[in-house]
């Protein structure tokens, strides 16, 4: 990850126990940009600083995810810690002037997709996985990565060997494995985007 | 705030390709997938296809593709569809269109451009 | 492809009415369906995304409901801005299909 998701990471390591509380319950009532969702309150509570910073960048990407940060910082009474995050974020690409948003920045990474931010429930919890193979074969999946999958003993080890193929994929082909998520395990998939 | 701000009416020949734009503002190009919309006069929508211009890949409808391209020119935050060998057929508005919520479960479109009416006439 | 069939294509309704439409879906698209308002010479408007969820902004008149292969769209309290098309939408499988549309007069 980029520069913004280690700064986030640096102010949110250096909140006491009790300041680490209190973010987390600002952050359930902070203003949010339009098109943002709030990150559910049950995960929220029991992140520690390394799961938060994660799961900031992954909802908010990591220009909007560090410029709120700043903001809660700033709510709960720590300017300074804010002022060092927003810098840290800056430095290189010259901050705007006091007074003047910056204008939106690509992350450094795009956000996490669906299937990314739920990697761990999905090798945990998808059972239909040769329906998703055969959704997926030919599209996204050759014939020898099809066997290697198909191969291994349980549905997790299999979720797990398609998982490691993923980082090659571009968007549309995680697209594409959502899809097929939708189309057979549809409980499953609004059971992760409430969680 | 989101906006997404597309070119002009075009008026164009039979046979003749056009590159409808839509530039995006209040938020990053790469950050969500741009599709786009096609409305026939009297008719419903139709969906022709996406592109996520964070890795340039992009998913097409079959019964557009070899006649819409789709790009982005991420330094001015622009998205691009090209139509090519252009028949009457093609006349309709056409939206570009952007999912509400990052990360989503499905695409939901929130945002929209305004329209670009294409009219293709000799 | 999966096929959407929207009815009625029309209806004319009076003002403080509630009204119904609904949207058929060829095969099983479960809660992925989203709803549309158009009003005459605009772009569409988003009111309902996953059957039953209220886009922010939308007016509570606007109610969704169904799974699976049938969703109903109710607009209770008919108003004069009511008026114009609504199309739905799944958005389950690609391509993504849109009903052929409902449009909405007030008599």
């Known amino acids: 990850m980029g520069r913004a998701r280690d700064a986030i990471l640096d102010a949110l390591e250096n909140l006491t126990a009790e300041e680490l509380k209190k973010f987390k319950l600002k952050l359930l009532s902070v203003p949010l940009r339009e098109g943002y969702g709030r990150i559910p309150r049950g995960a929220l509570l029991s992140m520690d600083a390394l799961d938060l910073t994660d799961k900031l960048v992954s909802f908010y990407l990591e220009t909007y995810g560090a410029e709120l940060t700043a903001n809660v910082l700033r709510d709960m009474g720590l300017q300074e810690m804010a002022g060092q995050l927003q810098a840290a974020t800056h430095q290189g690409s010259g901050a705007a002037p006091a007074g003047i948003q910056a204008p939106p920045q690509s992350a450094a990474k795009p956000g996490l997709h669906f299937i990314d931010q739920h990697r761990a429930a999905l090798i945990a919890r998808v059972t239909n996985v040769e329906w998703l193979l055969d959704a997926l074969y030919g599209k996204v999946l050759t014939d020898e990565q099809y066997q290697a999958v198909r191969a291994e003993p349980t549905n997790p080890s299999k979720m797990r060997k398609l998982f490691s193929f993923t980082p090659a994929w571009n968007w549309t082909c995680k697209d594409l494995l959502l899809q097929a998520l939708r189309e057979s395990q549809s409980y499953l998939v609004e059971d992760l985007e409430r969680s | 705030q989101v906006q997404l701000q597309q070119s002009d009416a075009e008026l164009v020949k039979p046979g003749a390709s056009v590159k409808i734009s839509c530039k995006v503002s209040?938020?990053?190009?790469?950050?969500?997938?741009i599709h786009w919309m096609k409305q026939r006069p009297e008719q419903g929508l139709a969906w022709i296809g996406y592109?996520?211009?964070?890795?340039?890949?992009?998913n097409y409808n079959d019964k557009f593709k070899g006649k819409a391209t789709l790009t982005a020119d991420i330094s001015s935050s622009t998205a691009y569809m090209q139509l090519n060998s252009l028949t009457s057929e093609d006349s309709a508005v056409y939206f570009c269109?952007?999912?509400?919520?990052?990360?989503?479960?499905?695409?939901?479109?929130?945002?929209w451009g305004q329209g670009t009416t294409l009219t293709v006439s000799s | 492809d999966i096929q959407m069939n929207q009815s009625p294509s029309s209806l004319s309704a009076s003002l403080g009415d509630t009204i119904t439409i609904t949207c058929h879906a060829s095969q099983n698209i479960n809660v992925w369906l989203s709803w549309y308002q158009q009003k005459p010479g605009n772009v569409p408007k988003l009111l309902i995304y996953k059957a039953s969820k209220l886009h922010t902004g939308v007016s509570s008149n606007f109610s969704g409901s169904g799974s699976g292969t049938g969703f109903t769209l109710t607009i209770s309290s008919l108003q004069p801005e009511d008026i114009g098309t609504y199309y739905c939408q799944q958005g389950q499988s690609y391509p993504y299909t849109f009903g052929g549309g409902t449009k909405l007069e007030i008599k």
């Open positions: 269109t952007r999912p509400y919520y990052f990360g989503s479960s499905y695409d939901y479109f929130g945002y």
């Open positions: 592109m996520y211009p964070g890795d340039g890949s992009a």
């Open positions: 209040g938020y990053a190009l790469t950050d969500h997938s």
